[in-house]
């Protein structure tokens, strides 16, 4: 398994800007993915989001989220996905083994995978932003 390069920790306001951008991009991706009619979300796929045993901004499961988005990129060439991956790269602060995700082979299952992960990713970025802003409020009180 590959390991991602070590990066310097970013100030939490930098992280917040990145997550705000990711939140916006995730909405764009989901809007486009939802154009594909007749596709239902699947219970078979779960995107890791926030780690309960870490403090913001280190609680975002960026390496795993990035691995799922890279899998979607194998199935879909929307350029917003490249941009999302670039932003997720900035949130990976230490060595982390790359998560291996098996790509669905069935056409309809591909669509379900993309829709499900896109929806969960959008929800995850909402949660991540809330956790960052509430963490920042707690730090100032």
């Amino acid at each position: 398994s590959h390991t991602l390069p070590v990066r310097l920790l970013r100030p939490s306001d930098d992280v917040q800007k990145i997550v705000e951008e990711l939140q916006s991009l995730s909405k764009m991706l989901l809007k486009d993915v939802e154009e594909e009619k007749g596709v239902l979300v699947s219970q078979n796929y779960t995107l890791p989001c926030l780690s309960p045993d870490a403090q913001p901004p280190n609680n975002i499961h960026s390496p795993a989220i990035r691995a799922y988005l890279k899998t979607i990129r194998q199935l879909d060439n929307k350029s917003v996905i490249d941009e999302i991956i670039e932003h997720l790269d900035k949130l990976i602060f230490q060595d982390a083994p790359e998560t291996n995700i098996s790509v669905p082979t069935d056409t309809h299952e591909c669509k379900r995978f993309i829709l499900t992960i896109s929806q969960q990713f959008s929800e995850c970025m909402d949660l991540a932003l809330k956790s960052l802003t509430s963490g920042a409020q707690q730090a100032t009180t």
Epitope: M28, V33, E35, E36, N77, K78, V80, C110, K111
Partner: antibody
Framework: QSQLVESGGGRVQPGGSLRLSCAAS?????????ICWVRQAPGKGLEWIVC?????????YYAPWAKGRFTISKDNSKNTVYLQMNSLRAEDTATYFC???????????????WGQGTQVTVSS | AFQLTQSPSSLSASVGDRVTITCQAS??????LAWYQQKPGKPPKLLIY???KLASGVPSRFSGSGSGTDYTLTISSLQPEDFATYYC??????????WGFGTGTKVTVK
């Protein structure tokens, strides 16, 4: 029946401009595909010019040589993509095709669609 | 800059021959590769997409294979209507790769 129809070609003098249109019929502009312009000079190969994404953002990708002189745009209400070509040269003489490509690997071949092409001749 | 290198540029073959055309990308394109057949005065006709999927209505004598940077189009038994020019194309659509065509392979009668 889905189709793409190019128009706007013709003869133009070197240094002149043309605007080509690619009208979609039988389908509407929605997310999940790209519309591209490709050209083919007489007796030569296919040459990609530019693509525009049909979706929530109008992302564009230009061939390096096309940046500056060529501009792609779209009008969703008219289901049409345009190619504005400026400072035309003799070597721009070609048949210009527009084509639709999928943005996903699912149901892919329903997204590959080409027009018949429009002829552009740059000559004094 | 990204490049797709197609070879050979031309080949002569007889009806019934097995024909192989290759396409090499200067960086990985994750199977975002299509093969087309083109005849004079006509737009290209899709044969293969996503490196190995046969387009609807295309005879099974055409097949595609490959991944990463190296791809192949094979015609298992050349038919009279197969004499034409063939192109590979990437439709990766983003990043630093985008789009592009191979230089073409003209298949003529031996």
């Amino acid at each position: 029946q889905s189709q793409l129809v190019e128009s706007g070609g013709g003869r133009v003098q070197p240094g002149g401009s043309l605007r080509l249109s690619c009208a979609a019929s039988g389908f509407s502009f929605s997310a999940n595909y790209w519309i591209c312009w490709v050209r083919q000079a007489p007796g030569k190969g296919l040459e990609w010019i530019v693509c525009i994404y049909i979706g929530s953002r109008a992302d564009t990708y230009y061939a390096p040589w096309a940046k500056g002189r060529f501009t792609i745009s779209k009008d969703n209400s008219k289901n049409t993509v345009y190619l504005q070509m400026n400072s035309l040269r003799a070597e721009d003489t070609a048949t210009y095709f527009c084509a639709r490509f999928s943005s996903g690997i699912y149901d892919l071949d329903r997204f590959f669609l080409w027009g018949q092409g429009t002829q552009v001749t740059v000559s004094s | 800059a990204f490049q797709l290198t197609q070879s050979p540029s031309s080949l002569s073959a007889s009806v019934g021959d097995r024909v192989t055309i290759t396409c090499q990308a200067s960086q990985s394109i994750d199977s975002w590769l299509a093969w087309y057949q083109q005849k004079p005065g006509k737009p290209p006709k899709l044969l293969i997409y996503q490196a190995s999927k046969l387009a609807s209505g295309v005879p099974s004598r055409f097949s595609g294979s490959g991944s990463g940077t190296d791809y192949t189009l094979t015609i298992s038994s050349l038919q009279p209507e197969d004499f034409a020019t063939y192109y590979c194309q990437t439709y990766y659509g983003g990043g630093h790769i985008g789009w592009g065509f191979g230089t073409g392979t003209k298949v003529t009668v031996k």
